[in-house]
Amino acid sequence: MKVLQEPACVSDYMSISTCEWKMGGPTNCSAELRLLYQLVFQSSETHTCVPENNGGVGCVCHLLMDDVVSMDNYTLDLWAGQQLLWKGSFKPSEHVKPRAPGNLTVHTNVSDTVLLTWSNPYPPDNYLYNDLTYAVNIWSENDPAYSRIHNVTYLKPTLRIPASTLKSGISYRARVRAWAQHYNTTWSEWSPSTKWYNSYREPFEQR
């Protein structure tokens, strides 16, 4: 049994780190493999993660952690029974992928404006809470040529779009993702998308 692609891990900087790797052949990850992890810290214990399959030769493991701080460093050992397949380390603060924003809602009852709101995925006491900026993707199912990214570089998780910039009488979808500038993170996954119908019509005199 051999590791084809070494484990690569990202942290949500809250309670979960996700490690993914590829094996040299088809593997029943949960039956054959264990990923052991231990914080380099006084009197810390070794913890075990049971991986899941992620495609035919891919495995993924979700490591449960405490809150993350910048000093944290983990040793990782990938075992197949009594055989050590791979040994490495992981510093969560240097490999952060934020959680996806949630509760994306579209408010169309505001005159002339489409208001999008969503929730910050972190509690106020988390370091990432005040560091997230967002990208909102809006596209149309009726007009495949229409797709826009709106960068939200302020802290408030809202975006206002003049309804007049969207075509009337067609449906749009929106999704949002986040990243944290000062932690040099990757982008989060996209939130689930939300659909709405743009019924706004310009006043007659403006037509």
Partner: antibody, heavy 125, light 112 residues
């Protein structure tokens, strides 16, 4: 009541052996790391050894490494210190102390918040 | 190994007056914001040590609020706002960030 009670001290000749015990009660013993600290007559406190809650990880002062062995029996809520090749400079009162909560991924530290009454070890010919 | 240096080594105090003991470590004991791995212990004559302060500034259960800990990184202080007769004994700082745990030399607090 959270309590630690040491035993096993006594008079031993240089080169001899002693086994100290520390019985814990009033807390979930296996969840906590444990520590031994000693105090030579008229001197300050000196850390001797520590062990994680599971017993998988042990730590020793250079002065006792290779001679002392820390262990625990969580089924008996008891901590041990096996002392071999004893020297005159090992003469001290030995205390056990409750250390950090080590079942969490990052052990939670609340100080060495409970200490035993101490057991005296005298090494002399 | 980390070295812990305590001062003064002797501290005569008048009851009701404040007292202050300093402890300096040879390397930072700050693991993360608010988590300085330094403790303060009091050992009264003929007794086992007792915990006063842990993680730099957190008062242990049952410890009177006249005791307080402060500092960060390498410099730490134990303050007693108003010394009482029962406070006499040896005070020790200890680094608990990593083994070997290291105690300061001890400060003998006595009543004038």
């Amino acid at each position: 009541e959270v309590q630690l009670v040491e035993s096993g001290g006594g008079l031993e000749q240089p080169g001899g052996s002693l086994r100290l015990s520390c019985a814990g009660s009033g807390f979930t013993f296996r969840d906590f790391a444990m520590t031994w600290v000693r105090q030579a007559p008229g001197k300050g406190l000196e850390w001797v050894s520590s062990i994680s809650g599971s017993g998988d990880n042990t730590y020793y002062a250079d002065s006792v490494k290779g001679r002392f062995t820390i262990s625990r029996d969580n089924s008996k809520n008891t901590l041990y210190l096996q002392m071999n090749s004893l020297r005159a400079e090992d003469t001290a009162v030995y205390y056990c102390a409750k250390d950090r909560l080590s079942i969490t991924v990052r052990p939670r530290y609340y100080g060495l918040d409970v200490w035993g009454q101490g057991t005296t070890v005298t090494v002399s010919s | 190994d980390i070295v812990m240096t305590q001062s003064p080594l002797s501290l005569p105090v008048t009851p009701g007056e404040p007292a202050s003991i300093s402890c300096t470590s040879s390397q930072s004991l700050l693991y993360s914001i608010g988590y300085n791995y330094v403790d303060w212990y009091l050992q009264k004559s003929g007794q086992s040590p007792q915990l006063l302060i842990y993680l730099g500034n957190k008062r242990a259960s049952g410890v009177p609020d006249r005791f307080s800990g402060s500092g960060s990184g390498t410099d730490f202080t134990l303050k007693i706002s108003r010394v009482e007769a029962e406070d006499v004994g040896f005070y020790y700082c200890m680094q608990s960030l990593q083994t070997p745990y290291v105690f300061g030399q001890g400060t003998k607090l006595e009543i004038k």
